[in-house]
Amino acid sequence: MAVTACQGLGFVVSLIGIAGIIAATCMDQWSTQDLYNNPVTAVFNYQGLWRSCVRESSGFTECRGYFTLLGLPAMLQAVRALMIVGIVLGAIGLLVSIFALKCIRIGSMEDSAKANMTLTSGIMFIVSGLCAIAGVSVFANMLVTNFWMSTANMYTGMGGMVQTVQTRYTFGAALFVGWVAGGLTLIGGVMMCIACRGLAPEETNYKAVSYHASGHSVAYKPGGFKASTGFGSNTKNKKIYDGGARTEDEVQSYPSKHDYV
């Protein structure tokens, strides 16, 4: 029962997480105009992965897509790629996990197959979550770098008269949605991996039975040579699980700096 609950909860948490990753990827507010300590403007700028928008105080909002592909900064392309990979892996993971759910019966699918599928989806969710967290973190790092660069050069002009006030950008709502969603997907993936251990079918263990013969006693173990591997947990399934556990630490993100704004 606990295994089913863990698996079901893992699925639901991952589902929410992936929905959040999709939402964050589509959102326009990855970076928003910094309003703190700035002159009050009648125009508010914000940018996403796919387009930049301007909202005027009149209420009119205009968005322009980044119609160029080659002209975009490499870091922005990298963030896009990480988010898309995260969504694709998450979507596949969700599809696999639906069939892996213990509460759903599909034909004569064995528990071992369900365990394998649960583990596979768990790993996919973990990688998906890490991709989202990495993507959002790279973008955030980019913003921080640009923020301090533009703060250093905030006022540019000649003869002491201010000519241009540079627009500074800070973290947008999409970053927080992305971090939370990535974290949820990651947690969901870990829960699926934990559930996999409980789902793994273990071979029946038989205790030794003593038969007392006249003259001398001999202990017989039923199952022939198989008895030698019959004690403890099934090593084949254990190996699969351990392999999955190692996969958790395989994906790493290396944030780098790029002026995208």
Epitope: P39, A42, V43, S52, E56, S57, S58, T167
Partner: antibody, heavy 118, light 113 residues
Framework: EVQLVESGGGLVKPGGSLRLSCAAS????????MSWVRQAPGKGLEWVST????????YYADSVKGRFTISRDNAKNSLYLQMNSLRAEDTAVYYC???????????WGQGTLVTVSS | DIVMTQSPDSLAVSLGERATINCKSS????????????LTWYQQKPGQPPKLLIY???TRESGVPDRFSGSGSGTDFTLTISSLQAEDFAVYYC?????????FGGGTKVEIK
């Protein structure tokens, strides 16, 4: 047809109060930011205040900050300007205007005259 | 506050001639987000409310004759009336629509020569 009609102007003593109203029609009032602009006799235009469409943000000229309050009633399609602690220099024709593209004031009322004199 | 300086204060022009009015802001009105200049031009005739002519420094309001054109970027802007008509004699104002307070220029009176 877009129409903006101001009312509530008149003669008031210094230190007194007055409430201007602007009745709007012919456009989606609740989705539009609205402004008040004044013009002293024989002088140029002076922006007074702006209120955003959602009533979330209000902006004021330094000369009226703390004395004037802009508000709106979307249900009645009305814009208001509550003027307190009036001074002689507040004497002007007060125009109500709608903000359009580029934050430009694309539609204006005919104005209402406010005279502050003892 | 942003200071809007209009020049000249008044301008005497003959019918059919070109009129040029300048407007200078103390800070750039160019928004980096959409590369648009938030400068607006208005026309005001005696006893009437102002009328919007041009917004985003160069976009004509619908119904405004094409003899009116706006140009400039950053801090320096120009309103040009290519061939003055009798109905164009009025006072013209520029306005900063980028920073609050939304300041107006002092106005330029275009008179018949």
């Amino acid at each position: 047809e877009v129409q903006l009609v101001e009312s509530g102007g008149g003669l008031v003593k210094p230190g007194g109060s007055l409430r201007l109203s602007c009745a709007a029609s012919g456009f989606s009032f609740s989705n539009s930011a609205m402004s008040w602009v004044r013009q002293a006799p024989g002088k140029g235009l002076e922006w007074v205040s702006t209120i955003s469409s959602g009533d979330s943000y209000t902006y004021y000229a330094d000369s009226v900050k703390g004395r004037f309050t802009i508000s709106r009633d979307n249900a009645k399609n009305s814009l208001y300007l509550q003027m307190n602690s009036l001074r002689a220099e507040d004497t002007a024709v007060y125009y109500c205007a709608r903000q359009g593209y580029g934050n430009a004031l694309d539609y204006w009322g005919q104005g209402t005259l406010v005279t502050v004199s003892s | 506050d942003i200071v809007m300086t209009q020049s000249p204060d008044s301008l005497a022009v003959s019918l059919g001639e070109r009129a040029t009015i300048n407007c200078k802001s103390s800070q750039s009105l160019l928004n980096s987000g959409n590369q648009k200049n938030y400068l607006t031009w208005y026309q005001q005739k005696p006893g009437q409310p102002p009328k919007l002519l041009i917004y985003w420094s160069s976009t004509r309001e619908s119904g405004v004759p094409d003899r009116f054109s706006g140009s400039g970027s950053g801090t320096d802007f120009t309103l040009t009336i290519s061939s003055l008509q009798a109905e164009d004699f009025a006072v013209y104002y520029c306005q900063n629509d980028y920073y609050y307070p939304l300041t107006f220029g002092g106005g330029t009176k275009v008179e018949i020569k």
